[in-house]
């Protein structure tokens, strides 16, 4: 079997809402993946599991099941949405994200995604993780070209 390639393209959109009484931020983050099948037979994308981390804490999880079939030597682009909640011990972000005096409220989130594919009864898991800027101050739709630009910030180890 040849490889199945998973490429995390980036954040497609982020829709934000706030709860002032709970000092809580709700961010619905839609991400884009490219999955390429380099084989001469079809493969099934069984599931995609994703999670988002802020300051080393998981703030959102999502799982998509029975997604699609990818034909021989074909590629499919898949969008998936992770609902996230920034609250409690991370509620210091509420003040930053709702601050009117700044235009862009970029926060750094770590996107983790695992794609499970199946062919001829065999399963394979491919994982990716990427740090991304997301604006928590307004609803934002990103161009995919912008999305690469978003990936510049890696934490120092």
């Amino acid at each position: 079997p040849r490889s199945i390639e998973v490429k995390y393209i980036g954040v497609k959109s982020a829709y934000v809402s706030y709860d002032a009484e709970k000092r809580t931020i709700y961010l619905n983050i839609t991400n884009t993946l490219n999955i390429t099948n380099n084989n001469y037979y079809s493969v099934e994308v069984e599931n995609i599991t994703a999670q988002v981390q802020f300051s080393k804490t998981v703030i959102g999880k999502a799982r998509l099941n029975n997604i699609t079939n990818i034909g021989p030597l074909d590629m499919k682009q898949i969008d998936y949405t992770v609902p996230t909640v920034i609250a409690e011990e991370m509620s210091y972000m509420y003040d930053f994200c709702t601050l009117l005096s700044i235009k862009v409220h970029n926060i750094v989130l770590m996107m983790q995604v695992t794609v499970t594919t199946a062919y001829f009864g065999h399963s394979e898991q491919i994982s990716q993780e990427r740090y991304q800027y997301v604006d928590c101050g307004r609803n934002t739709t990103y161009q995919l070209a912008q999305s690469e630009y978003l990936n510049v910030l890696q934490p120092q180890q």
Epitope: E21, R23, E88, E89, S91, Y92, M93, Y94, P155, Q157
Partner: antibody, heavy 118, light 107 residues
Framework: QVQLQQSGTELARPGASVKVSCKAS????????ITWVKQRGGQGLEWIGE????????YYNEKFKDKATLTADKSSSTAYMELRSLTSEDSAVYFC???????????WGQGTTVTVSS | DIQMTQSPASLSASVGETVTITCRAS??????LAWYQQKQGKTPQLLVY???MLAENVPSRFSGSGSGTQFSLKINSLQPEDFGSYYC?????????FGAGTKLELK
């Protein structure tokens, strides 16, 4: 205005427990967390942990996990910190503060002095 | 755990002077740093959080800057009430740790 009123000085024997209270007023108690900080002999500050009264979720510094228990009573807008198995190392001033998140205290109590002595 | 290193440990200055206190994190904390002032025998007072957001009722002569691992607190035109101890504290992940403090004394 926002105020945090802490209970008075505690004198305790080694091995005993004490419970420090922190009564909040001037804001909605369940909107913010209450964080607790230790200061020994006018030296540096050490974060103990915090509690979010809305959910009763607690977050502790590993160092204090076996030493401190944080609780909150929504009906009286009061947070509590119990310190157990006291030793001389626990003699310090303990502050509560309203937390903006992750230990960031924007309004502080006056401090409670705990002295452990036989 | 993330360690915070503050410098200098002590500092002498005169009223009207401008002083800068620095704080270094052992790893990237982005912008998530707070600064406190504590006067002798009093409670700490929050000055700055999220790196440069001024807390309520804090005079504009205080300003925070920096990101990543290097941060500073600048006090313009020192006033008599500004003398005391200053602490930095990261609030990126658990446990949020404080620096050892900087004692600002009147020259």
């Amino acid at each position: 205005q926002v105020q945090l009123q802490q209970s008075g000085t505690e004198l305790a024997r080694p091995g005993a427990s004490v419970k420090v209270s922190c009564k909040a007023s001037g804001y909605i108690f369940t909107t913010y967390g209450i964080t607790w900080v230790k200061q020994r002999g006018g030296q540096g500050l050490e974060w103990i942990g915090e509690i979010y009264p809305r959910s009763d979720n607690t977050y502790y510094n590993e160092k204090f996990k076996d030493k401190a228990t944080l609780t909150a009573d929504k009906s009286s807008s009061t947070a509590y910190m119990e310190l157990r198995s006291l030793t001389s190392e626990d003699s310090a001033v303990y502050f509560c503060a309203r937390s903006k998140g992750s230990g960031t205290g924007d309004y502080w109590g006056q401090g409670t002095t705990v002295t452990v002595s036989s | 755990d993330i360690q915070m290193t503050q410098s200098p440990a002590s500092l002498s200055a005169s009223v009207g002077e401008t002083v800068t206190i620095t704080c270094r994190a052992s790893e990237n904390i982005y912008i998530y740093l707070a600064w406190y002032q504590q006067k002798q025998g009093k409670t700490p007072q929050l000055l700055v959080y999220n790196g440069k957001m001024l807390a309520e009722n804090v005079p504009s002569r205080f300003s925070g800057s920096g990101s990543g691992t290097q941060f500073s607190l600048k006090i313009n035109s020192l006033q008599p009430e500004d003398f005391g101890s200053y602490y930095c504290q990261h609030h990126y992940g658990s446990p949020p740790a404080f620096g050892a403090g900087t004692k600002l004394e009147l020259k």
